[in-house]
């Protein structure tokens, strides 16, 4: 580092302002050091002195340049449905997000506040929008033609076979159910599954649209922690 | 090594508004604030203005109060300064430059430049 | 706004020689004063910083000194390298400002 010259409080210009990484202190009119981020003002300036600053304790924390008297405290431990995903530093405060499988159903400046279980659409009902980090899955009746036999919170309506012979026809819980002759299927047989949610700040999954429905047979359950609706379980 | 590099000429028709980039490399962006400066043969070196990227302050000369704004990226330690209702008068050398001006110490000196864009505002 | 003014445009000198520049300021800086360089088609380089500290990329026959309101820049020793023009600039108070600049010109 350059040689230091240590900093003296100055007046500004009549109309003018302090530099960046200053403050205006009213009771000495003089702009004066604001204090770095992990630190605070422990001594604040007068016409003569400069700031003194200090050491944020132990979980607080100040993130910005500041002149507050006391660093902010850290929010609390994340909680069980929860994962860290920044720590506590003196420069920082705790970020907790939602783990895999959950929402964030009440969110705060940074992380999540309340996380709730996403949404799991029961046998005869399909996702028709996924889950998010701050959006519970919706759950649509699956189209004639079309099924779902689990309980999921990423499984969609898929196709039912197309028999030679039907033996027993499919319905919205469950497939078709062919004579011994081999089946045909107008998409590949097994489960669709959509991506569960990434809960972490940087990455945002984008999963592929469900196929579309018949007109008419699409609703919207509320999204948020809500009573199990139709078409869903609420464990 | 820390390097400021700067998007490159422009020709810009009067009236127009442009946005010149500086990207920071070599050190950590949001330790130190970030300055423009306009360069004529006529008014030789002027401060524009200024921003904290850590916060997003922004300070200005008055001069250019309406003519400029400063923004910075955290994420790609760029910093951007927009000049608008561009006359002939705009025409310049516009560089970013870093300042060392630090806690506890009056030191506000520029230590590292971009290597300057020419605007050139003609029709 | 504080001014600051270069009163020599130009100042001729030899390799060998020494040379001063001036600069003045409209009111009291402190020694809140950089010294830059800058050569033809090149961003300006700081020499001096707080009036009289060389910075770590200068050469040492660089020295400033001054404070309050007058402040000179001087070159021991003259190399033609050394050709160029200087800027000094305040950071007392927003607006920076700097002066006009003087060139030094190798005869």
């Known amino acids: 580092l350059p040689a230091q010259v240590a900093f003296t409080p100055y007046a500004p210009e009549p109309g003018g302002t302090c530099r960046l990484r200053e403050y205006y202190d009213q009771t000495a009119q003089m702009c004066c050091s604001k204090c770095p981020p992990g630190q605070h003002a422990k001594v604040f300036c007068t016409k003569t002195s400069d700031t003194v600053c200090d050491s944020c304790e132990d979980s607080t924390y100040t993130q910005l340049w500041n002149w507050v008297p006391e660093c902010l405290s850290c929010g609390s431990r994340c909680s069980s449905d929860q994962v860290e995903t920044q720590a506590c530093t003196r420069e920082q405060n705790r970020i907790c997000t939602c783990r895999p499988g959950w929402y964030c159903a009440l969110s705060k400046q940074e992380g999540c506040r309340l996380c709730a279980q996403l949404r799991k659409c029961r046998p005869g009902f399909g996702v028709a929008r996924p889950g998010t980090e701050t959006s519970d899955v919706v759950c649509k009746p699956c189209a004639p033609g079309t099924f779902s036999n689990t309980t999921s919170s990423t499984d969609i309506c898929r196709p039912h076979q197309i028999c030679h012979v039907v033996a027993i026809p499919g319905n919205a819980s469950m497939d078709a159910v062919c004579t011994s002759t081999s089946p045909t299927r107008s998409m590949a047989p097994g489960a669709v599954h959509l991506p569960q949610p990434v809960s972490t700040r940087s990455q945002h999954t984008q999963p592929t649209p469900a196929p579309s429905t018949a007109p008419g047979t699409s609703f919207l359950l509320p999204v948020g922690p809500s009573p199990p609706a139709e078409g869903s379980t609420g464990d | 090594q820390v390097q400021l590099q700067q998007s490159g000429a422009e020709v810009v028709r009067p009236g127009a508004s442009v946005t010149l980039s500086c990207k920071a490399s070599?050190?950590?962006?949001?330790?130190?604030?970030m300055h423009w400066v306009k360069q004529t043969p006529v008014h030789g070196l002027e401060w524009i203005g200024a921003i904290d990227p850590e916060t997003g302050d922004t300070a200005y000369n008055q001069k250019f109060k309406d003519k400029a704004r400063v923004t910075a990226d955290k994420s790609s330690s760029t910093a951007y300064m927009e000049l608008r209702s561009l006359t002939s008068e705009d025409s310049a050398v516009y560089y970013c430059?870093?300042?060392?001006?630090?806690?506890?110490?009056?030191?506000?000196?520029?230590?590292?430049w971009g290597q300057g864009t020419t605007l050139t505002v003609s029709s | 706004d504080i001014v600051m003014t270069q009163s020599q445009k130009f100042m001729s000198t030899s390799v060998g020689d020494r040379v001063s520049v001036t600069c003045k300021a409209s009111q009291n800086v402190g020694t809140n004063v950089a010294w830059y360089q800058q050569k033809p088609g090149q961003s300006p380089k700081v020499m001096i910083y707080?009036?009289?500290y060389r910075y770590s990329g200068a050469p040492d026959r660089f020295t400033g000194s001054g404070s309050g309101t007058d402040f000179t820049l001087t070159v021991n020793n003259v190399q033609s390298e050394d050709l160029a023009e200087y800027f000094c600039q305040q950071y007392k108070t927003y607006p920076y400002t700097f002066g006009g600049g003087t060139k030094l010109e190798i005869e």
């Open positions: 070599g050190y950590t962006f949001s330790d130190y604030e």
């Open positions: 430059t870093r300042d060392i001006h630090y806690y506890g110490s009056s030191l506000s000196y520029f230590d590292y």
């Open positions: 707080s009036a009289s």
